[in-house]
């Protein structure tokens, strides 16, 4: 105790009343109104607390202070007076803030503000949503994904910002009347070959396909080394002059010739260039056959060998470079007799013939098309007299009951050497080239030098043998009729060139012969 | 009647490029390559390379290679030769014309003189 | 490449007479272009395929050959025939001219 009589032990936030009370500070309070024990505590008053009477007001606070209490306007709202705190609800001049207004950039992108008392929100913009982890945040709705599905099974679904479209897949397109983006298209299959929209070489024939397409090497051409068939980038050459080279074991400058020829014009080759292509190679068979040259001096057998190589070449490159060649009929000829004529033609039913100077042939068009082959259908026919020179003293074969007919009614005809051609040797070929058992026959009228009285005539084809050469055979083949100058053959085939032969029993000096091929 | 027609001269600087076009007309434009062919004044004919219309494919020297582009355009049966990194030596008459094997170059365009001056 | 050289490079001749140049090939060739080129003029096919005339080119021309020699011949020279003469080979790539033939009036 002190002199004046002010107890000294008063607990903290108290005050003595004289030496022996004390009393709590304002804003304090104690378990009595008077302490008279140091052992007693003056505790705070939450003035803040439910049953008390401090009342600040709306829109406000209020905040328990150490013996006090202040007033403040709740988060969002402010005091018009400008003073920070207050006591009661008098002193309250809290009213609302328009964050908006405040901060325009409050909802970042995509977002635009809504105050709200005391708050604001943010309302995201269509195609937008409220990040869960930030209210605040508008971002895209990836409508693609979001399982509503909102496209045409025809189209996929393309999430752009703030909305999506709905888009024709690649190699698709909007139905007629369609839109192409908006969630009510619909597309369908866009067929690039027939519409032009593919980048197929020239080398190969588009094929369309679902959604797509692909390029497949034309008939008689194969993809190019290391590139794959029925790709869009597959590339493409020419079998026809790679296998048509000459035969082996057989030397002749001439001949090498007509092949670098041959070769040269296979090796820029392409399908516009098939009119020109064959016009050169039958040139150029043209000029070899009329100037054979060191071929000539070749054992006969050889010569046989190299006509026979001749013959099933030409076939094979010019029924190649034919399916080339633009619909319609075709007639070539020229200096040395050679001669074409060729007709192309989509599937047609019909019968066909070709007329050339020395012959003629009429056979079905249905023929000529192997099925599944999406070429045009060619038949063609080519006359080569050059090819008698070749041919000379080649042999025939019979079968075992022709030869026993003959054997009975012409007696000469085995005893006296090779038979002779009396006429042209033709060549008929097809865009198709299985050609051993026709459904329909084909007919050759040939025309050709008169036949010496009693002399057997017979319609016959080169048959090419295991041994690259060859020989004259009958089989499948029939003479209908003939006349002093023309006979008429049927043909069950087209295996190789068919051709007329007149079989002597009267030794004479071989005219020159001439050959169709 | 097979025609070539061919764009006009042009001056260029050196390192420039040029791009000079053979419009065809009177055959069918993929029958033929189209061979590009230059002659130096007072020189011979050099082959630079050929286009074939049909499918745009090309072939070239290798003297050129890299610098020589050969293009077409089938709807115009046009087709163009650009020749980039010129130098005064490309000074030339540059020719098209149409080619096969077999004919030679059969028709020839009236040459498009390229001048190549600093 | 093929290298075709063309011999003489330069000839004189006089009206009437007969010339003939010829073309050297480093391979063998199969098929031998030639052309004739006026000052100029754009260059013009003359004979093709060794010995087929172009169309319009009168029948004094001719031409033969085989693997690496070719000739070019004019059985009796006229005036317009004065020119320069090319031969071109079409038998591997790159396509190759020879240095030409200088036909002078003599």
């Known amino acids: 105790q002190d002199s004046r009589g002010c107890a000294r032990w008063c607990p903290q936030d108290s005050s003595c009343v004289n030496a022996t009370a004390c009393r709590c500070n304002p804003g304090f309070s104690s378990f009595s109104e008077i302490i008279t024990t140091p052992m007693e505590t003056c505790d705070d008053i939450n003035e803040c607390a439910t049953l008390s009477k401090v009342s600040c007001g709306k829109f406000s606070d209020c905040w328990n202070t150490e013996g006090s209490y202040d007033c403040v306007c709740s988060p969002g709202y402010e005091p018009v007076s400008g003073a920070k705190t207050f006591k009661n609800e008098s002193e309250n001049t809290c009213q609302d803030v328009d964050e908006c207004q405040q901060n325009p950039r409050l909802c970042k992108s995509y977002g635009t503000c809504v105050n709200t008392l005391g708050s604001y929100t943010c309302q995201c913009l269509p195609g937008f949503k409220l990040k869960p982890e930030d209210p605040k945040l508008c971002t895209d709705v990836n409508e693609c994904t979001s399982g509503q599905n909102p496209c045409h099974s025809s189209t996929h679904c393309l999430n752009n910002v703030g909305s999506y479209q709905c888009r024709c897949r690649p190699g698709w397109q909007p139905i007629p009347g369609s839109p192409n983006g908006p969630n009510n298209t619909v597309c369908e299959d866009v067929d690039e070959c027939s519409s032009g929209q593919h980048q197929c070489d020239s080398s190969t024939v588009c094929f369309n396909t679902v959604g797509s397409y692909s390029c497949r090497c034309r008939p008689g051409w194969k993809p190019r080394h290391g590139i794959p068939n029925n790709q869009k980038d597959t590339v493409c050459e020419d079998m026809t002059f790679s296998t048509w080279t000459p035969p082996p074991g057989v030397h002749s400058q001439t001949l090498s010739r007509f092949f670098d020829k041959v070769q040269d014009l296979g090796r820029d080759y392409k399908p516009g260039l098939a009119n020109n292509t064959i016009q050169s190679i039958l040139q150029a068979l043209d000029e070899l056959l009329e100037a054979p040259g060191d071929l000539e001096t070749l054992p006969r057998l050889q010569q046989h060998c190299v006509a026979s190589h001749l013959l099933d070449g030409l076939e094979d490159v010019l029924r190649g470079l034919s399916k080339n060649l633009s619909n319609g009929l075709l007639n070539f000829s020229y200096p040395a007799g050679t001669e074409l004529s060729l007709e192309v033609q989509k599937q047609v039913d019909r019968s066909v013939t070709l007329r050339q100077n020395q012959a003629v042939m009429q056979l079905d068009w249905n023929q000529a098309q192997k099925s599944g082959d999406p070429g045009p259908s060619v038949v063609g026919l080519v006359s080569i007299p050059g090819m008698g020179k070749l041919l000379a003293e080649a042999p025939l074969v019979l079968e075992p009951e022709k030869q026993m007919l003959l054997h009975e009614t012409h007696q000469g005809l085995l005893q006296d050497g090779s038979p002779i051609l009396l006429s042209d040797v033709i060549s008929a070929f097809l865009s198709n080239n299985d050609t051993q058992n026709l459904s329909s026959p084909v007919t050759f009228t040939f025309s050709h030098r008169s036949v010496i009285p009693r002399q057997k005539v017979l319609c016959v084809f080169w048959e090419h043998g295991q041994n690259g050469c060859g020989h004259w055979a009958t089989t499948g083949c029939s003479t209908i009729g003939t006349r002093d100058t023309s006979t008429i053959c049927r043909c069950t085939h087209l295996s190789s060139f068919a051709v007329l032969m007149a079989h002597y029993d009267v030794q004479e000096e071989d005219p020159v012969l001439t050959v169709i091929t | 009647q097979v025609q070539l027609q061919q764009s006009g001269a042009e001056v260029k600087k050196p390192g420039a490029s040029v791009k000079v076009s053979c419009k065809a007309s009177?055959?069918?434009?993929?029958?033929?390559?189209m061979q590009w062919v230059r002659q130096a004044p007072g020189q011979g004919l050099e082959w630079m390379g050929a286009v074939y219309p049909g499918d745009g494919d090309t072939r070239h020297t290798q003297k050129f290679k890299g610098r020589v582009t050969m293009t077409r355009d089938t709807s115009t049966s046009t087709v163009y030769m650009e020749l980039s990194s010129l130098r005064s030596e490309d000074t030339a008459v540059y020719y098209c014309?149409?080619?096969?094997?077999?004919?030679?170059?059969?028709?020839w365009g009236q040459g498009t003189l390229v001048t190549v001056s600093s | 490449e093929i290298v075709l050289t063309q011999s003489p490079a330069t000839m004189s001749a006089s009206p009437g007479e007969r010339v003939t140049m010829s073309c050297s090939a480093s391979s063998s060739v199969s098929y031998m272009h030639w052309y004739q080129q006026k000052s100029g003029q754009s260059p013009k096919r003359w004979i093709y395929?060794?010995?087929k005339l172009a169309s319009g080119v009168p029948a004094r021309f001719s031409g033969s050959g085989s693997g690496t020699d070719y000739t070019f011949t004019i059985s009796s020279m006229e005036p317009e025939d004065f020119a320069t003469y090319y031969c071109q080979q079409w038998s591997s790539n790159p396509l190759t001219f020879g240095g030409g033939t200088k036909l002078e009036i003599k």
């Open positions: 395929d060794t010995s």
């Open positions: 009177g055959y069918t434009f993929t029958n033929y390559w």
């Open positions: 014309a149409r080619g096969f094997t077999a004919y030679g170059m059969d028709y």
